[in-house]
Interface confidence: medium
């Protein structure tokens, strides 16, 4: 193992501020694989918070393995969480469009679709099941129309997807009981908002399907949902065009929709999912 | 010195409720994620919930899952466990304990409550 | 979700080594942390992040994780060593599991 031959470390009483990890992996033992080589990578340390030297064996492990220390700290450490620059024909993707693929810790083969900012393509991926981030979609269309940029360039202003269970997230039963809105948007919008595991507080919003709006809530940094969004008007775009305001049985206002999927209805209280 | 104290064990009939406190010295307790792990007569660790720091955000083991819950108040600097619907198997040694930060492992123990339940 | 084996018991002489296994599925993937416990009180951290030591442990302690085992070994092993040994991790969802401990007896 690549860290047994490693240092002792000392805890001291001193109390760190609270980590905030960038991506799941950085939450990942160092791990040097199964085979022989002796090749030089770097790893983040969760103990010490800090990017650090070990030796990979040249085939498996995981994602905390880095090339250079510049990238490690690049994935791993919240001094560069603004990497990501977006272009003005790039303004109404939602930010999570430009994260990297992440499996997260977990071990399903699971297959999702992701936007390659590289390709500017959506592209297939395992998923592990759990963790991970919000650039992972259930269908290659529900990716390409969220992420996607139509064929002049700007982004295709469509969403639509039937409402699945995603990463065994609380999702609405259907009821006979008639509700305010009817819903055509991104599947994650209805689900609660879920602070994570990891012990940060950001300042995100999620789409509370309950009243229609995008309200503020404390994420803890990793983990989850994709109903998790770092401005309200990045949470608006995405999630308050799928409702359409149901009026009467017979009538529908205040759709922009051109392409109806399954309906879903939904009726149900607010929920605070406290998960870790 | 930092130090965890709990209080509020005893004996209790099965279907009966308890509520534990950890009262936290020594240390910001508000910075710090806390867990509940228990221990019955003659057997091994099994931990029981967690929360965060905030209180935002809990988790529990499957076997009390829907009967217990964890909670804090940071103002008072005291951790909680509220155990309803008890059964004999819960029968245990309760231990209110500290995670430092992120790493998942409890650095600082309290001494334990008995929580004993039998008709 | 991850399960933790341990050995009922293990002898040792005193001041010979002792290794007590923790087995798990691909347990080389996780940080394992190690509790020292004695009669009537509660644990004591010894091990965590698969090796690090916390202050006050004594240098005999130390721990090593490879393929699907850790193993916490303590060198030089002294009476006062007896204790029952936990291993703990956690699971996908990152809960605590621990192992079903392991009774250390110092002839």
């Known amino acids: 193992d690549s860290e047994e031959d490693e240092e002792h470390t000392i805890i001291t009483d001193t109390e760190l501020p609270p980590l905030k990890l960038m991506h799941s992996f950085c939450a990942f033992k160092a791990d040097d694989g199964p085979c022989k080589a002796i090749m030089k990578r770097f790893f983040f340390n969760i103990f010490t918070r800090q990017c650090e030297e070990f030796i990979y064996g040249g085939c498996e492990g995981n994602q905390n393995r880095f090339e250079s220390l510049e990238e490690c700290k690049k994935m791993c450490t919240r001094d560069n969480a603004n990497r990501i620059i977006k272009t003005t024909l790039q303004q109404e993707k939602p930010d999570f469009c430009f994260l990297e693929e992440d499996p997260g810790i977990c071990r399903g083969y699971i297959t999702r679709y992701f936007y390659n900012n590289q390709t500017k393509q959506c592209e297939r991926f395992k998923y592990g099941g759990c963790l991970g981030n919000m650039n992972n979609f259930e269908t290659l269309e529900e990716c390409k129309n969220i992420c996607e940029d139509g064929p002049n360039g700007f982004q295709v202003d469509n969403y639509g997807t039937q409402l699945n269970a995603v990463n065994n997230s609380l999702t609405p039963q259907s009821t006979k009981v008639p509700s305010l809105f009817e819903f055509h948007g991104p599947s994650w919008c209805l689900t609660p908002a879920d602070r994570g595991l990891c012990r940060a507080n950001e300042n995100r919003f999620y789409y509370n399907s309950v009243i229609g709006k995008c309200r503020p809530f404390k994420y803890s940094g990793c983990g989850g949902n994709e109903n998790n969004f770092t401005s309200k008007q990045e949470c608006l775009r995405a999630c308050k065009k799928g409702f359409i305001q149901r009026i009467s049985k017979g009538g529908l206002i205040k759709t922009k929709r051109k392409r109806k999927k399954q309906r879903v209805k939904i009726a149900y209280e607010e929920i605070f999912v406290k998960n870790m | 010195q930092v130090q965890l104290v709990e209080s509020g064990g005893g004996l209790v009939q099965p279907g009966g409720s308890l509520r534990l406190s950890c009262a936290a010295s020594?240390?910001?307790?508000?910075?710090?994620?806390m867990n509940w792990v228990r221990q019955a007569p003659g057997k091994g660790l099994e931990w029981v919930s967690a929360?965060?720091?905030?209180?935002?955000?809990?988790s529990y083991a499957d076997s009390v899952k829907g009967r217990f819950t964890i909670s804090r108040d940071n103002s008072k600097n005291t951790l909680y466990l509220q155990m309803n619907s008890l059964r004999a198997e819960d029968t245990a040694v309760y231990y209110c304990a500290r995670y430092p930060d992120w790493g998942w492992y409890t650095d600082v123990w309290g001494q334990g409550t008995l929580v004993t339940v039998s008709s | 979700d991850i399960e933790l084996t341990q050995p009922p018991s293990v002898s040792v002489a005193p001041g010979q080594t002792a290794r007590i296994s923790c087995s798990g599925d691909n347990i080389r993937k996780f940080y394992v942390h190690w509790y020292q416990q004695k009669p009537g009180q509660a644990p004591v951290l010894v091990i965590y992040?698969?090796?690090k030591r916390p202050s006050g442990i004594p240098e005999r302690f130390s721990g090593s994780n490879s393929g699907n085992t850790a193993t916490l070994t303590i060198s030089g092993t002294q009476a006062e060593d007896e204790a029952d040994y936990y291993c703990?991790?956690?699971?996908?969802?990152?809960?605590?599991?621990f192992g079903g401990g392991t009774k250390l007896t110092v002839l």
């Open positions: 929360i965060l720091s905030d209180g935002s955000s809990t």
């Open positions: 992040g698969t090796n």
């Open positions: 020594g240390f910001t307790f508000s910075s710090y994620a």
């Open positions: 703990q991790s956690y699971d996908s969802k990152f809960n605590t599991v």
